[in-house]
């Protein structure tokens, strides 16, 4: 996911609705004006704000990368939701890119979890049932399987 820079909005476009801040804050879907006296709406499909705020700009919408599918579009109150394409996943410790799921488990291990957009296949030792570390095995050690079918 590419999080763009924040979008300054120093001049309100004619279509942007204005209202007054409540307790110094503007509602989701708005940002505060530079003089602090008005709430200016974010631009649909361009930027958003999710909470009551006194930000001087709305947050720019995320654009889904190639290799991602758009689950839901950006609205004035919610950012775009992107998901890795089938056969790829995004790890918590490297959320900036989708990685290819492994095609199978190392020898002596059995697959217990499928490839999902947020996790690689899950392998456990046949005997002990302990999980594999997740290191990609050497090709000759791999027992391949097509997605969604258990390894033999």
């Amino acid at each position: 996911i590419t999080q763009q820079d924040l979008a300054p909005q120093q001049r309100a476009a004619p279509q942007q609705k204005r209202s007054s801040p409540s307790e110094g804050l503007c509602p989701p879907g708005h940002h505060i004006s530079e003089d602090g006296r008005d709430c200016i709406s974010c631009k649909y499909g361009q930027d958003y704000s999710t909470h009551w705020n006194d930000l001087l700009f709305c947050l720019r919408c995320t654009r889904c990368d190639s290799g991602e599918v758009e689950l839901s579009p950006c609205t004035t109150t919610r950012n775009t939701v992107c998901q890795c394409e089938e056969g790829t996943f995004r790890e918590e410790d490297s959320p900036e890119m989708c990685r290819k799921c492994r095609t199978g488990c190392p020898r002596g291990m059995v697959k217990v979890g499928d490839c999902t957009p947020w996790s690689d296949i899950e392998c456990v030792h046949k005997e002990s049932g302990t999980k594999h570390s997740g290191e990609v095995p050497a090709v000759e050690e791999t027992v391949t399987s097509s997605p969604g079918t258990p390894a033999s």
Epitope: L25, G36, L56
Partner: antibody, heavy 117, light 110 residues
């Protein structure tokens, strides 16, 4: 002349309370957001909190619960009520005028608060 | 909250030197950043706002640049009266995120 003057500082014992005042002249405090900032001896600037033009108040985590910002529009004066004072609250306390896009454009000269037994 | 990381914390320079101070925000603040100068025993004085707009009465040797998370204050030719401490402060979302100042940069005579 547009200016801010803080008063009310002095020596106070730990656990005590103090109210600082910030008198504005040349402009109307209720038309601006106003901010309190402090500076411990030899240290940097520390944001305490602010009050919006509509009277809403917001505080830094370190000030929540012990410090209260208020305003008297008829006196054109801002206040900082400080309770349960500790030695680490010893600092010069500044009030300042805050404009949303343009930053803190007008500062008072500060008042020194010393918390010591 | 937004954290502001200022560097260096101190520097030694001579009159006439070009001095650069940087400030990094923990999240993007567009161009809504101010720079302040403080001399001993005095309150801070605003130098620059909106990252690059010079405040009234501030000499043109001071300039600011940057947007997003990375900002720079430059003094093109250091003068004797410029030896002071400099602070940055974000100006967007003070209620939302707080208004923590950078840690300060003390500019000393070499």
């Amino acid at each position: 002349e547009v200016q801010l003057v803080e008063t009310g500082g002095g020596l106070i014992q730990p656990g005590g309370s103090l109210r600082l005042s910030c008198a504005a002249s040349g402009f109307t405090v209720s038309r601006y957001a106003m901010i309190w900032v402090r500076q411990a001896p030899g240290k940097g600037l520390e944001y305490i909190g602010f009050i919006t033009s509509d009277g809403s108040t917001y505080y830094a985590d370190s000030a929540k619960g012990r410090f209260t910002i208020s305003r008297d529009n008829s006196k054109n004066t801002l206040y900082l009520q400080m309770n349960s004072l500790r030695a680490e609250d010893t600092a010069v306390y500044y009030c300042a005028r805050y404009t949303y896009s343009d930053g803190t454009d007008l500062w008072g000269r500060g008042t020194l608060v010393t918390v010591s037994s | 909250d937004i954290q502001m990381t200022q560097s260096p914390s101190s520097l030694s320079a001579s009159v006439g030197d070009r001095v650069t101070i940087t400030c990094q925000a923990s999240q993007s603040i567009s161009t809504y950043l101010s720079w302040y100068q403080q001399k001993p025993g005095q309150p801070p004085k605003r130098l620059i706002y909106k990252a690059s707009t010079l405040a009234s009465g501030v000499p043109s040797r001071f300039s600011g640049s940057g947007s997003g998370t990375d900002f720079t204050l430059t003094i093109s030719s250091l003068q004797p009266e410029d030896f002071a401490t400099y602070y940055c402060q974000p100006n967007s979302g003070i209620a939302t995120y707080g208004a923590a100042f950078g840690g300060g940069t003390k500019v000393e005579i070499k």
